[in-house]
């Protein structure tokens, strides 16, 4: 079987994907311009350097991360430096018209370009659950509907919930999660016999999806703490973060061999354990007053996520058609509620000691901010799965799924697989 | 001791264009978000504007959006309010302040704790 | 919205003082209370609802209950007689009660 790309493909990405970029460029051109405003240069180089930390978290951790897969690692890394290129364009865009376009053009900054990386990083926490079973040219669909879906739905809940940029940028893990598996439940879901090995994780992918782990490990307190707006709300997010992390580490490790039989350690529960901290410390990681509480929420968290990872495959698998290695969906579905549970309880707790009159109105807020994120996560998952599933695209064939020759040119080989 | 001093004020027309400074001293000014806010004669407060610590990102009142930029050097501990397209309700007197952050329980707290003595803007033909 | 009442209040030295803010919405306790004299620098006196700005004295209390919050001078001493504004940071655009004018009757 030839390995080429579908004809009907090689005319419809690069047209489909060029025409798109040119429209971004002429959006540019028209309505962004930069800050023009002085500013001290040192302080310049470390807001930047905020910046460069989520592109590493986004480029090399999410892209290594989800490169486990025996035959589709180089299109996992790729097609993820891809969406985020081109997410990021649009959510500097969009983020611009939905919040200052009235005031004329839409004025480009350091923290526009922050918002936009973490944005465009929902995208790849989503795609985890259908990478292998679309095209780049489906790709580009899911990052269009995505990022203006998380735009539409941060600039909503910023407007009626009065919510600042990290509490309402912290929905993303609840949004991608459910965008995710939306998208997935949508998509052709058996693999054809013959097939089924080609979901397998490998060594050397899974090695590289080790380090993916680990870049996302190192550089989760940069995500957590970036759109915090003082130095000690960085500096508390950043501390606890750590702590979450490190303890999630831990018990990743060991409630990975005491869930196994023969004591194993499983690299998929390993892989997206070592996260769990991260991800459940989020919302309310500027908050947490003493490092112990951020370390009880990591053991906490690593242990829902390798109970997740032991349980929940075989019903993804079955339901959503998601392989057992990608199980950044439901993982951050179930950390990103947990996390969002701690906030209202915070929540509660404050209330309290304002006047007991308004604590109901405020869990209320609170749940309908969240239900508010998961129905437009779970409604805009599903159109994009309506789309993906359009002719037009040229979708893989079931038979091709998870197969970097679909997509790749490889010297060394004369014919397809 | 800790110290702002606004300076910059003055006479302008409308629609002409004015930058009041404020100068900190006695902190480490690149640790504090700071803040316009301004006074009209016979009126109350009006917050006008703030600006981060790092200077990443930047928040108006409705009334000067889109005609005033506030932009920091920290290396030289300035804080600078650019005002465009002046009206003459924007006759006041401006003061600066520093932010600080405290850590409630579901939010953290910014308040104004320190304030400058003002400088006068009067827009006028 | 920030409702404050009254607009002008008149009071003699060691009288008690109170003056209410008003939140249109629900703020929790993020509302700050400053003090301002004709000339002078704006003055903080209380921040998150009810915590004393350290060197204010403790005449000055906050409190809050629900929306409600109020400012409340034990003792009126002459220094006091002045402007009071509330202020809320729940969220941005930050905003002002619009002043509480104390005078000396």
């Known amino acids: 079987m030839s390995s080429k790309y579908p004809r009907s493909v090689r005319r419809c990405l690069p047209l489909w994907a060029l025409t798109l970029e040119a429209a971004l460029i002429l959006l540019f051109y028209f309505f962004t311009h930069y800050d023009a405003s002085l500013e001290d240069q040192k302080g310049l180089v470390a807001s930047y350097q905020v910046g460069q930390d989520l592109t590493v978290m986004a480029a090399i951790g999410l892209g290594f991360l989800t490169s486990s897969f025996r035959r589709h690692s180089w299109s996992s890394v790729a097609f993820n430096l891809f969406m985020l290129a081109l997410g990021v364009q649009w959510a500097i865009l969009l983020d611009g018209f939905l919040s200052q376009f009235p005031s004329g053009k839409v004025v480009i900054t350091l923290f526009s370009i922050r918002l936009a990386t973490m944005s465009a990083l929902s995208v790849l926490i989503s795609v985890d659950a259908v990478l292998g079973k679309v095209n780049l040219a489906q790709l580009v669909v899911m990052v269009l509907v995505e990022v203006t879906a998380l735009g539409n739905l941060r600039m909503v809940i910023s407007n009626i919930f009065n919510t600042d940029y990290h509490m309402n940028m912290m929905h993303i893990y609840v949004f991608a999660a459910y965008f995710g598996l939306s998208v997935a439940w949508c998509l052709p879901k058996p693999l054809p016999e013959g097939t089924e090995d080609k979901d397998q994780t490998a060594t050397i992918p899974s090695l590289s999806a080790m380090l993916g782990a680990l870049f996302l490990w190192m550089f989760w307190p940069s995500f957590n703490s970036a759109l915090l707006r003082s130095p000690i709300e960085r500096k508390n997010a950043v501390f606890n973060t750590y702590y979450a992390v490190a303890v999630s580490v831990v018990t990743a490790i060991s409630g990975s061999s005491l869930a196994h039989p023969q004591g194993k350690i499983s690299k998929t529960y390993v892989h997206s354990a070592v996260l769990a901290g991260g991800v459940a410390v989020g919302t309310s990681c500027h908050l947490i007053p003493s490092p112990w509480l951020a370390m009880v929420l990591g053991l906490v968290a690593g242990l829902i996520s390798v109970g997740g990872a032991k349980y929940l495959p075989g019903c993804c698998n079955r339901v959503l058609g998601i392989p057992h290695s990608s199980i950044m969906g439901y993982n951050f579905s179930l950390l990103g509620l947990l996390g969002e549970i701690i906030y209202i309880v915070l929540l509660v707790l404050d209330t309290v000691g304002a006047g007991n009159g308004m604590i109901g109105f405020q869990v209320l807020l609170s749940i309908g901010e969240l239900s508010l994120a998961i129905v437009i996560a779970l409604m805009s998952g599903l159109l994009t799965g309506l789309l993906l599933n359009l002719k037009i695209w040229k979708a893989p064939h079931e038979a091709k799924y998870f197969d970097d020759q679909v997509f790749w040119k490889f010297p060394h080989l004369a014919v397809g697989f | 001791q800790v110290k702002l001093l606004e300076s910059g004020g003055g006479v302008v027309q409308p629609g002409g264009s004015l930058r009041v400074a404020c100068v900190a001293s006695?902190?480490?000014?690149?640790?504090?978000?700071m803040h316009w806010v301004r006074q009209a004669p016979g009126k109350g407060l009006e917050w006008v504007a703030f600006?981060?610590?790092?200077?990443?990102?930047?928040g108006y009142g409705d009334s000067v959006k889109g005609r005033f930029t506030v932009s920091r050097d920290n290396s030289k501990n300035t804080l600078y309010l650019q005002m465009n397209g002046l009206r003459a309700e924007d006759t006041a007197v401006y003061y600066c302040?520093?932010?600080?952050?405290?850590?409630?329980?579901?939010?953290?707290?910014?308040?104004?704790?320190?304030w400058g003595k003002g400088t006068t803007v009067t827009v006028s033909s | 919205v920030m409702t404050q009442s009254p607009s002008s209040l008149s009071a003699s030295v060691g009288d008690r003082v109170t003056i209410t803010c008003r939140a249109s919405?629900?703020?929790?306790?993020?509302l700050n209370w400053y003090q301002h004299k004709p000339g002078k620098a704006p003055k903080l006196l209380i921040h998150?609802?009810?915590s004393l700005q350290s060197g204010v004295p403790s005449r000055f209390s906050g409190s809050v209950s629900g929306t409600d919050f109020t400012l409340t001078i034990s003792s009126l001493q002459p220094e006091d007689f002045a402007t009071y504004y509330c202020q809320q940071s729940y969220t941005t655009p930050y905003t002002f009660g619009q002043g509480t004018k104390l005078q000396i009757k």
């Open positions: 006695g902190f480490t000014f690149r640790n504090f978000g």
């Open positions: 600006i981060w610590f790092d200077a990443s990102n930047k």
């Open positions: 302040a520093r932010e600080k952050a405290v850590r409630g329980i579901s939010r953290y707290n910014y308040y104004m704790d320190v």
């Open positions: 919405q629900s703020i929790i306790r993020y």
């Open positions: 998150t609802a009810s």
